[in-house]
Each structure stands twice: as C-alpha cells, then as structure tokens.
Amino acid sequence: FERTRSLQDPCSNCPAGTFCDNNRNQICSPCPPNSFSSAGGQRTCDICRQCKGVFRTRKECSSTSNAECDCTPGFHCLGAGCSMCEQDCKQGQELTKKGCKDCCFGTFNDQKRGICRPWTNCSLDGKSVLVNGTKERDVVCGPSPADLSPGASSVTPPAPAREPGHSPQ
C-alpha cells in the first residue's frame, strides 16, 4: 500500500523538515528559515513560534520541530504549551485587575500564583485554632476545646452497646 501511495502521491516521500513544492514539480524542498514541518508529506511548512517579551525561548525551532517557550523570571506559564505568561505575586498576595494585592483578612496564599483562599474553619471539625493564620499561611487546627480542658481523657470511651431490637438512628 505504501508503494502504491507513493506512486500516486510523490509528496508522501517528503520527510519531516521538508515540504512538497508545487512550484518545483512537487520535489521535496527544505523548510525555509524560521519554519518547520514535524511530519512527512507536508505541502507547507509551519511558521516557528517566536518567544518575545515575557516569553523566552526554552527550545529553539528546528526544521522538524517548533520552538518552545517558557516565561521570563517573575512570570509563570499558564495553558497548554505555555500559551500564556502570568505575573508572579509575593506570598500573601493575589493578582487582581489592579496588579498584585495583599490577601484580605481571613484569607491566605502560600504561593506566588493563584488566589487567596479562606483560612480553615477549625470549629467545623470540632477543633480549636492552635496557630493563627496570616496572609501567607493557613491556620493550624489543634485538638478540640473539650480535649484541652483539665482532666479530659485522651482515650475515647467505647460506644454504648445498643439494646437488641433497636435499629441505629
């Protein structure tokens, strides 16, 4: 089948890094500078990605593969293949429409990216706050207040046995 196909379509013989040049009797021509073809049998070469501004070149374009970009220091990649660069903020901040802003009271961000998140509500788990939260750090929850009262046993008593014939509530 491959032989038949190549007899019918001379372009299928053109390897990656070349294109089938219709202007030159369908011979395989090398991709021009700043272009590439990653598969064989291409009728055109694709323009290389250019890494400009906050994008910097991680891998140069070759005749067979596209350039790859990452972000300049102070920015981080977003999206597939680093399609966007987003400015870093400091820990304890988030990126808003007005740039990097401190987390509001009761929220924190322990990374240079992402949004400020609410402190953990320890009481929802029946626990108390062991270490207060900051803009950069979540609260640390400790034992429940009852566990901290004088004379409180750390051993959980066994559950009372149910009387026969009673279904659980």
């Epitope: 906050v54 977003l78 660069c85 400015q87 990126l95 990097c100």
Partner: nanobody
C-alpha cells in the same frame, strides 16, 4: 506585518518627566487593548499599565498618580506619560498588545516592541 515601535526614552533627572510613544502598524489598533511593561537591570519583568480599546486604564501601584497611559486611535499610537520620575523607574520599557485583558497576563500571540531605555539619574 505587525510592528510596534517605542520611542521617547532617554536620560532624565529624578522628578523629571518623559513621554513614551508606541507606534503600531499591521493590525486593527482601535479594537486592541495595549499595555506597557518594563524590565529594570538585573530585575524581573514587571507589568506597568494597560488600556482597553474603550480607554479604560489600569496601573501598577508603584506608578499610580505619576504615570498616565493614553491612546490615539487616529495615529495608531499608545503613550505613557511619566512624571515625578524616580531612580527605581530606570528600566527598558516595552509596549505590547494585550489579548488576555487580564492584568499581568500575556498571550503567546501578543506582539511586542523592541523596548526603549529610560534612565533616571542625577
């Protein structure tokens, strides 16, 4: 072909003023949001200011009240008027398109100028 050309940079004393211009060609400028970013020597890139196609503006806190971004759709030009300049404003200033419309975020399809040097020194 898309082209962004910055001009207006130079050496200025602290407290002085400069107006940067960015002349744009090769795409529909009036529909495009634009932005300025800067990179100080040995420091990281920093978003400075952005302007929507409708003229709405945003600024980083450190330049608020001192810098003004504006645009002239008839001249396909975006400006950055900089006053009360400080030594810490010394940087290469870049003009760029702003397709994400998200402050501090640029897309791979955005276009960038080559930059213009601003030096604030006595």
């Amino acid at each position: 072909e898309v082209d962004l050309v910055e001009s207006g940079g130079g050496l200025v004393q602290p407290g002085g003023s400069l107006r940067l211009s960015c002349a744009v060609s090769g795409f529909t400028f009036s529909n495009s949001a634009m932005s300025w970013a800067r990179q100080a020597p040995g420091k990281e890139f920093e978003w400075v200011s952005s302007i929507y196609s409708d003229g709405k503006t945003y600024y980083v806190d450190s330049v608020k009240g001192r810098f003004t971004i504006s645009r002239d759709n008839a001249k396909n030009t975006v400006y950055l008027q900089m006053s009360s300049l400080k030594p810490e404003d010394t940087a290469v200033y870049y003009c760029a398109t702003w397709k994400t419309l998200r402050v501090g975020v640029w897309d791979e399809s955005d276009y960038w100028g080559q930059g213009t040097q601003v030096t604030v020194s006595s």
